[in-house]
C-alpha cells in the first residue's frame, strides 16, 4: 500500500546532505548524487523505465536543496514548495546495473519559482542519456526572499536560458487555456 | 570554420539610426547567441544584445530603448539597428557568436569589427 | 547592473615574469565569468571561460580561479605575444565587461 523504499530514500537522502556533505556556498553551483540502475527500474525493454527518472530526480533536487541551504531557509522562513511542472527529454536508455549520476543545477528563479535541471550522466562514457527541468513553486514566501535569506543581501537572479524561456511560455500558456476551458479565468490561479 | 563579417555605413549623421548586418558563414546560425558589442576609441568593450535563432532577444539595460537586433535564418544574417545615434555611439561594432551552455556562456568567435562614426 | 571592477589598470612587466589581474564582481556570478585578451586593432580572443577552464589552443601559461565575487587571471611566466589588453566578462546576467588591464613591456 505505501511504497516503503521511496519514503525510506527520501529523509536519507535528505539527511545525508544535511550531516553528511558539505554544506554548498555556490548557488549556482551543480551538484552531483551517484545512482545505479536496479532490477526493480527496468520495465518490459530492460531499460530504466521513465518513472523512475523523476524519481531519482526526486531525491537529486531534495539533496541539492537541502545542500545550498534553501529547504532550511524555506523553513525559517515558514514556507515551502511544491513541484509545479516538469518536463523530461531522453536521449538514451540507462540499461541494468549501469551507474549513472544525476548531475543536479539551479538554473535561476523569477518572481515565484526555482528552476532547477537534473542530468542523467552515464558513467560509463560520460553521455547525458536524460535531462529534466523542473519549476519548483514556492508558497508562503518568494525566490528573492529565500536568496537573499541565504546570502544576506539582495541579489539579481542569473538570466534563464533561452530554451527554459520557450518552456516557461509553454507553460503559461497552457495554464491559461485550461483556465479558459475550465471558465475559471479570474477565479483560481496554476501554480 | 564558422566566420562572421559586419557591413554596413561607416559615417551615420547624428538623430539617424545605425543599422549594421552581420553574416554568418561556413555554419548555421540555428542554437547560438548571436551578439552584437562595441568599442568607442581608447575605450573598453560594451555588449549591446543577443538574439536567439528563435527570436528571444536581450539587451544592454542602458541601450534598451534605442536597440533592435533581428535575425534572417533563410539569409544565415542578424542585424543591429540603433536609433537616435549620438557622438557618443562612435565605435569598431563586432558581431559575435555567443555559446548559450549554461556556465559557458562565451563570445568564442568574433567578426573583424566595422568602425562606424557618428558625425553630420 | 553588474558591474566589473578590474585591477590594475596597467602594469608593466618582463619576458618571463608571473602576471596576476584580478577581476571583482558587484554581486555574486557564481562562476559566469570570461577572460579575453585583444591586442590593437583585433578582435578579442578568449583565453578562459567558466572562472577556470582553458579554451582549446590557449597556452597553459593562463589559468584562471575565484568564484562568486573574486577572480583571478594569472600567465605564469609572460611571453612577448601576451603583450596586450586583457578583459573579464560576466555573463551571469546581461554581459558586462571589466575596463580592461593593459600589459605592457618593462
Known amino acids: 500500500l505505501l511504497d516503503v523504499w521511496y519514503l525510506v530514500r527520501l529523509p536519507c537522502a535528505v539527511l545525508r546532505a544535511r550531516l553528511l556533505q558539505p554544506r554548498v556556498r555556490d548557488l549556482l553551483a551543480e551538484q552531483r548524487f551517484p545512482g545505479r540502475v536496479l532490477p526493480s527500474d527496468l520495465d518490459l525493454l530492460l531499460h530504466m523505465n521513465n518513472a523512475r527518472y523523476l524519481r531519482e530526480a526526486d531525491f537529486a533536487r531534495v539533496a541539492h536543496l537541502t545542500r545550498c541551504g534553501v529547504l532550511g531557509a524555506l523553513r525559517q522562513l515558514r514556507a515551502h514548495t511544491v513541484l509545479a511542472a516538469s518536463c523530461a527529454r531522453h536521449r538514451r536508455s540507462l540499461r541494468l546495473l549501469e551507474p549513472f549520476e544525476v548531475r543536479t543545477r539551479l538554473l535561476g528563479w523569477d518572481d515565484r519559482a526555482f528552476y532547477l535541471e537534473a542530468r542523467f550522466v552515464s558513467l560509463r562514457d560520460g553521455f547525458v542519456c536524460a535531462l529534466l527541468r523542473f519549476r519548483q513553486h514556492l508558497l508562503g514566501t518568494s525566490p528573492e526572499r529565500v536568496v537573499q535569506h541565504l546570502c544576506q543581501r539582495r541579489v539579481e537572479p542569473p538570466e534563464l536560458p533561452a530554451d527554459l524561456q520557450h518552456w516557461i511560455s509553454y507553460n503559461e500558456a497552457s495554464s491559461q487555456l485550461l483556465r479558459m476551458e475550465s471558465g475559471l479565468s479570474d477565479v483560481t490561479k496554476d501554480q | 570554420p564558422v566566420q562572421l563579417q559586419e557591413s554596413g555605413p561607416g559615417l551615420v549623421k547624428p538623430s539617424e539610426t545605425l543599422s549594421l548586418t552581420c553574416t554568418v558563414s561556413?555554419?548555421?546560425?540555428?542554437?547560438?547567441?548571436w551578439s552584437w558589442l562595441r568599442q568607442p576609441p581608447g575605450r573598453g568593450l560594451e555588449w549591446i544584445g543577443y538574439i536567439f535563432y528563435s527570436g528571444i532577444t536581450n539587451y544592454s539595460p542602458s541601450l534598451k530603448s534605442r536597440v533592435t537586433i533581428s535575425v534572417d535564418t533563410s539569409k544565415n544574417q542578424f542585424s543591429l539597428k540603433l536609433n537616435s545615434v549620438t557622438a557618443a555611439d562612435t565605435a569598431v561594432y563586432y558581431c559575435?557568436?555567443?555559446?548559450?551552455?549554461?556556465?559557458?556562456?562565451?563570445?568564442?568567435?568574433w567578426g573583424q569589427g566595422t568602425m562606424v562614426t557618428v558625425s553630420s | 547592473d553588474i558591474q566589473m571592477t578590474q585591477s590594475p589598470s596597467s602594469l608593466s612587466a618582463s619576458v618571463g615574469d608571473r602576471v596576476t589581474i584580478t577581476c571583482r564582481a558587484s554581486?555574486?556570478?557564481?562562476?559566469?565569468l570570461n577572460w579575453y585578451q585583444q591586442k590593437p586593432g583585433k578582435a578579442p580572443k578568449l583565453l578562459i571561460y567558466?572562472?577556470?577552464s582553458l579554451q582549446s589552443g590557449v597556452p597553459s601559461r593562463f589559468s584562471g580561479s575565484g568564484s562568486e565575487t573574486d577572480f583571478t587571471l594569472t600567465i605564469s611566466s609572460l611571453q612577448p605575444e601576451d603583450f596586450a589588453t586583457y578583459y573579464c566578462?560576466?555573463?551571469?546576467?546581461?554581459?558586462?565587461f571589466g575596463q580592461g588591464t593593459k600589459v605592457e613591456i618593462k
Open positions: 567558466a572562472a577556470s
Open positions: 559575435a557568436r555567443e555559446l548559450p551552455v549554461i556556465g559557458r556562456r562565451t563570445f568564442d568567435i
Open positions: 566578462q560576466q555573463s551571469y546576467n546581461a554581459r558586462t
Open positions: 561556413g555554419g548555421s546560425i540555428d542554437s547560438y547567441y
Open positions: 554581486q555574486t556570478i557564481s562562476t559566469y
